[in-house]
Interface confidence: low
């Protein structure tokens, strides 16, 4: 006859490991006992358990409560055992020795491999601001046995770099994602993907990119200078910018205080019926936590009477 076992038994941390050992004998042969031992290189054999055909299972004190026979029905030629709640320290070489009658003794070895699934963590880098060069957006670390694979899934353009640290029974892998921040990256997901044989599916951690920026400010409302004449109602200047976090707006006049009756409403400066005192240089100040911007415009309120007077002069001169 001969022993049937596996070269390698792979189990995930915390699961039960079935250590197979089956004697395939000729008819009439019987198994008297099966002895299980751990036989790591350079160390003496450590007994796990003894299965006796007459007296049943005896577990050594070091493995008390952790070694059991598989549930019935059991074949009398099956010497397999269950090692409950596998831990990393259980990883190693195991041997089953089978005493049979009348064929004698047989032995076989297997290797138990305990997979330690990673628990990945994602750490965002420093605050991202438009105008920075290549900047760390996030780093992702996962430790497991064997070493996990760490990659990135994103639409954002960037570069990755990985490094690995080996420990006695595991390995930690850290991958960094660097990018050049731009406002279009706002709200884009950056996902760390961790693969490992101990995981049923990839683990994914998503970080949402936030890039602080403040666009250049500009002022709208002076497109047609001829509309800015004495007596005109409803004249307004609007400050245009955008930013994240959203900016606040402030209006001042460079050449003195804002004239009375001029209304500041956020990004808009509203004028009462225009007079020449509304002529001047107006400045829109835009700011957020990231930056501030200014834009200035010159308002020149026209006097229609002056203009018509000039036209009359021109006509009479011709």
């Amino acid at each position: 006859g001969e022993l049937e076992t596996s070269d390698v038994v792979t189990v995930v941390l915390g699961q039960d490991a079935k250590l197979p050992c089956f004697y395939r004998g000729d008819s009439g042969e019987q198994v008297g006992q099966v002895a299980w031992a751990r036989v790591d290189a350079g160390e003496g054999a450590q007994e796990l358990a003894l299965l006796h055909s007459k007296y049943g299972l005896h577990v050594s004190p070091a493995y008390e409560g952790r070694v059991e026979q598989p549930p019935p029905p059991r074949n009398p030629l099956d010497g397999s055992v269950l090692l409950r709640n596998a831990v990393q320290a259980d990883e190693g070489e195991y041997e089953c020795r089978v005493s049979t009658f009348p064929a004698g003794s047989f032995q076989a070895r297997l290797r138990l491999r305990v997979l330690v699934p990673p628990l990945p963590s994602l750490n965002p880098g420093p605050a991202l601001e438009e105008g920075q060069g290549l900047t760390l957006a996030a780093s992702c670390t996962a430790e497991g046995s064997p070493a996990p694979s760490v990659t990135w899934d994103t639409e954002v353009k960037g570069t990755t770099s990985s490094r690995s640290f080996k420990h006695s029974r595991s390995a930690a892998v850290t991958s960094e994602f660097h990018l050049v921040p731009s406002r279009s990256m706002n709200g884009q997901p950056l996902t760390c993907v961790v693969s490992h044989p101990g995981l049923l599916q990839d683990q994914r951690i998503t970080h949402i990119l936030h890039v602080s920026f403040l666009a250049e400010a500009s002022v709208r409302g002076l497109e047609d200078q001829n509309l800015w004449h004495i007596g005109r109602e409803g004249a307004m200047l609007k400050c245009l910018s955008e930013g994240q976090p959203p900016p606040s707006y402030n209006w001042t006049r460079l050449d003195g205080p804002l004239p009375s009756g001029v209304r500041v409403d956020g990004d808009t400066l509203g004028f009462p019926p225009l007079t020449t005192e509304h002529s001047g240089i107006y400045v829109c100040h835009v700011s957020n936590e990231f930056s501030s911007r200014d834009s200035q415009v010159t308002v020149d309120v026209l006097d229609p009477q002056e203009d018509s007077g000039k036209q009359v002069d021109l006509v009479s001169a011709s």
Epitope: S184, N186, G187, Q188, P189, T206, I208, H210, E242, Q244, P245, P246, S248, E289
Partner: antibody, heavy 117, light 106 residues
């Protein structure tokens, strides 16, 4: 667990100033914004404004001329003042917390303010 | 300001149904969008942030998708506790909310 609680008078006369306080417990205001959002009866939500941990504020442009948001860090409180109120300001007023970006992960239970003479 | 157009304004559905609510922004909001659920007399609760990310404790039957100006909230296998009003909200610039979608029992 972070909790936010609004308090203040439930009735305000037209043209007066509405004043509410939001008390934050179970967490500090550091690195967060405290926002005010309102909801007129049977209607949708309207963002009023925010005060950031650094003390800076942003307001909804449509309300900016009437709104002031301030804070008392020692008491972990944020206050809202809305001046020159009219019946259109009748609403449930909520305070809410956000990170640096304007989505709100914790909300107060809301307080109904009625503007009526 | 950016306008958020939410549809439908209301819908009737049965337990077990799949419900889809859409939100359209008047300009690109770069996935800066959140979804909230509000029950009668209660404050809104964050469901999804940054268009696709489920907030802590939100059941996996909720999912968010979309980019640019078009966004969707999907509820698979509607449960009795899911009835209420849902709002989208952008946080690209001055925040504004959609008009809401009332999900009622058929």
């Amino acid at each position: 667990q972070v909790q936010l609680q609004e308090s203040g008078p439930g009735l305000v006369k037209p043209s007066e100033t509405l004043s509410l306080t939001c008390t934050v417990s179970g967490g500090s205001l550091t690195n967060y914004g405290v926002h005010w959002v309102r909801q007129p009866p049977g209607k949708g939500l309207e963002w009023i404004g925010v005060i950031w941990s650094g003390g800076s504020t942003n307001y909804n442009p449509s309300l900016k001329s009437r709104v002031t948001i301030s804070r008392d860090t020692s008491k972990n409180q944020v206050s809202l003042k809305l001046s020159s109120v009219t019946a259109a300001d009748t609403a449930v007023y909520y305070c809410a917390r956000s990170g640096k970006w304007y989505y709100f992960d914790y909300w107060g239970q809301g307080t109904l303010v009625t503007v009526s003479s | 300001d950016i306008q958020m157009t939410q549809s439908p304004a209301s819908l009737s559905a049965s337990v077990g149904d799949t419900v889809t609510i859409t939100c359209r922004a008047s300009q690109n909001i770069y996935s800066n969008l959140a979804w909230y659920q509000q029950k009668q007399g209660k404050s809104p609760q964050l469901l999804v942030y940054a268009a696709t990310n489920l907030a802590d404790g939100v059941p996996s039957r909720f999912s968010g998708s979309g980019s640019g100006t078009q966004y969707t909230l999907k509820i698979n296998s509607l449960q009795s506790e899911d009835f209420g009003t849902y709002y989208c909200q952008h946080f690209w610039g001055t925040p504004t909310f959609g008009g809401g979608t009332k999900v009622e029992i058929k």
